[in-house]
C-alpha cells in the first residue's frame, strides 16, 4: 500500500502517467467513450469516471498502467469526498447567500457559457 | 413571457437582484441551509439549488424578488442542460484522453485542493 500522497501531487503524477501510457490506451480503435461537449469539467465528473471505468476494463493491466488507474480511482475518491462536503454544514441564510453570490460570480467570470 | 436573454446576462442580473433583496432574504433568523465547505462550486450545484428552493419557500413572493427566483430557476435549467451534455457524444479513446488530460490539468491548476 503506497504512502498517502497529497491529492495535488497525485494529480501531477497521474498526468505524467497518462502521457506515458497514451499509446497503449488508444490501441483499441473501435472503442467509443462519452466525451463532454463543454469545458465545465466539474459538472461532468460522473461521466468522466464512467469513461475511465470503460477504458480500464478494455486495457491490459500490469506495470505502471495499473498505477495510473489506481491513481484515477484515488482522485475519484477525493472528488466523492468533496461532493459529500457540499451539504454537511447547515448555516444561516446570510452565509448561504454569500456562497451563492460567490458561485454566481465565478459562473459570471470563469465558466465557459454558451447561450 | 420575457424575451430570452443570454445566460451570461442572466447571471449578471441575478447577482444584482441578489444584492437588492438581501435584507428581505435574511429576515428569517432561524432558517438553516446547507453551505458547501469548499470552493469547487460546480461539484455542489445540486445542493446549491436545493438551498435556493428552501429559501424560496420561506420568502414572501412579489415584485422583483419573484424575478430573482425565476432567474435562478433559469440558471438551474442552463446547468441541467450542461449536465446532459456530459454524456451525449461518444468519441474515440484518443479524444476522451484529451478531455481527461484537460480535466486533470484544470484540477491541477485551478481547483482548490486541500489534502
Amino acid at each position: 500500500i503506497p504512502t498517502e500522497i497529497p491529492t495535488s501531487a497525485l494529480v501531477k503524477e497521474t498526468l505524467a502517467l497518462l502521457s506515458t501510457h497514451r499509446t497503449l490506451l488508444i490501441a483499441n480503435e473501435t472503442l467509443r467513450i462519452p466525451v463532454p461537449v463543454h469545458k465545465n469539467h466539474q459538472l461532468c465528473t460522473e461521466e468522466i469516471f464512467q469513461g475511465i471505468g470503460t477504458l480500464e476494463s478494455q486495457t491490459v493491466q500490469g506495470g505502471t498502467v495499473e498505477r495510473l488507474f489506481k491513481n484515477l480511482s484515488l482522485i475519484k475518491k477525493y472528488i466523492d469526498g468533496q461532493k459529500k462536503k457540499c451539504g454537511e454544514e447547515r448555516r444561516r441564510v446570510n452565509q448561504f447567500l454569500d456562497y451563492l453570490q460567490e458561485f454566481l460570480g465565478v459562473m459570471n467570470t470563469e465558466w465557459i457559457i454558451e447561450s | 413571457i420575457p424575451t430570452e436573454i443570454p445566460t451570461s446576462a442572466l447571471v449578471k442580473e441575478t447577482l444584482a437582484l441578489l444584492s437588492t433583496h438581501r435584507t428581505l432574504l435574511i429576515a428569517n433568523e432561524t432558517l438553516r441551509i446547507p453551505v458547501p465547505v469548499h470552493k469547487n462550486h460546480q461539484l455542489c450545484t445540486e445542493e446549491i439549488f436545493q438551498g435556493i428552493g428552501t429559501l424560496e419557500s420561506q420568502t414572501v413572493q412579489g415584485g422583483t424578488v419573484e424575478r430573482l427566483f425565476k432567474n435562478l430557476s433559469l440558471i438551474k435549467k442552463y446547468i441541467d442542460g450542461q449536465k446532459k451534455k456530459c454524456g451525449e457524444e461518444r468519441r474515440r479513446v484518443n479524444q476522451f484522453l484529451d478531455y481527461l488530460q484537460e480535466f486533470l490539468g484544470v484540477m491541477n491548476t485551478e481547483w482548490i485542493i486541500e489534502s
Epitope: 454544514e89 447547515r90 448555516r91 456562497y99 460567490e102 | 432561524t30 453551505v35 469548499h38 470552493k39 482548490i112
Partner: antibody
Framework: QVQLQESGPGLVKPSQTLSLTCTVS??????????WSWIRQHPGKGLEWIGY???????YYNPSLKSRVTISVDTSKNQFSLKLSSVTAADTAVYYC?????????WGQGTLVTVSS | SYVLTQPPSVSVAPGQTARITCGGN??????VYWYQQKPGQAPVLVVH???DRPSGIPERFSGSNSGNTATLTISRVEVGDEADYSC???????????FGGGTKLTVLG
C-alpha cells in the same frame, strides 16, 4: 481541529494604525461554511465584535468602528488580517480572532495591544 | 442597532442554581448563544441556538429564550463555573454580531 493564532505588535502609538494577522491551521480559510472574525475586549469589560470576512472577500463591520476598520483575507497563506486606523488609548484591548459559523466556534488565545506613546 | 442587556454580576452558593439573563427587543425570535470566559482565557461556547449544548459541556448548563428575555441556567453550581458569561445574537437587519455586556458569576464560599 482548527487552530487560530494572532500575531502583531503589542504596542502601537496613538494616531497610528494597528495591524494584526490571524493564521489558521488545521483547516482551510476557503471553507465556505465559515466567516473569519475579529473581536476585542477592553480590560475588565465585555466582548466587542469588530467585524468578519468571507473567503470571497465580503466584509461586515461593527458600525461604531466601520470608518477605521479594514479586514482582509489571504487564502494562499491561510491568513486574515485586521487594520484599525487612527488609534487612541480607547483601543487598548485584547484582540481575538475567531472562526464564525452559526456561532464563534474556534478562538485564538488573544493578543494584548496597548496604545501608548 | 440591536442592544443586549445583561446584569453585571450574579452571585450563588455552590450547589445552588444560577440564572443569568439577557434582555433584548423580541429576542425570542432570534437564536441566542452563550459563552463562558475564565480569566486570561478565550471564550468557550456553552449553549447555542437558545438551548443546545455543544459536546463536552455538562448537562448542568441549559438555556431558554422567549419574549424579550433569554436565560442561561446553571444548576448545581460548582466553584469551577466562576467566570464571565456573555450572550450573543445576530442582528439580521444588518447581519452584524451583537454581544451582551457580560455577567460575572461569583460562586460564594
Amino acid at each position: 481541529q482548527v487552530q487560530l493564532q494572532e500575531s502583531g505588535p503589542g504596542l502601537v502609538k496613538p494616531s497610528q494604525t494597528l495591524s494584526l494577522t490571524c493564521t489558521v491551521s488545521g483547516g482551510s480559510i476557503s471553507n465556505g461554511a465559515y466567516y473569519w472574525s475579529w473581536i476585542r475586549q477592553h480590560p475588565g469589560k465585555g466582548l466587542e465584535w469588530i467585524g468578519y470576512i468571507y473567503y470571497s472577500g465580503s466584509t461586515y463591520y461593527n458600525p461604531s468602528l466601520k470608518s477605521r476598520v479594514t479586514i482582509s483575507v489571504d487564502t494562499s497563506k491561510n491568513q486574515f488580517s485586521l487594520k484599525l486606523s487612527s488609534v487612541t488609548a480607547a483601543d487598548t484591548a485584547v484582540y481575538y480572532c475567531a472562526s464564525l459559523g452559526n456561532w464563534f466556534d474556534y478562538w485564538g488565545q488573544g493578543t494584548l495591544v496597548t496604545v501608548s506613546s | 442597532s440591536y442592544v443586549l442587556t445583561q446584569p453585571p454580576s450574579v452571585s450563588v452558593a455552590p450547589g445552588q442554581t444560577a440564572r443569568i439573563t439577557c434582555g433584548g427587543n423580541n429576542i425570542g425570535s432570534k437564536n441566542v448563544y452563550w459563552y463562558q470566559q475564565k480569566p486570561g482565557q478565550a471564550p468557550v461556547l456553552v449553549v447555542h441556538d437558545d438551548s443546545d449544548r455543544p459536546s463536552g459541556i455538562p448537562e448542568r448548563f441549559s438555556g431558554s429564550n422567549s419574549g424579550n428575555t433569554a436565560t442561561l441556567t446553571i444548576s448545581r453550581v460548582e466553584v469551577g463555573d466562576e467566570a464571565d458569561y456573555s450572550c450573543q445574537v445576530w442582528d439580521s437587519s444588518s447581519d452584524h454580531v451583537v454581544f451582551g455586556g457580560g455577567t460575572k458569576l461569583t460562586v460564594l464560599g
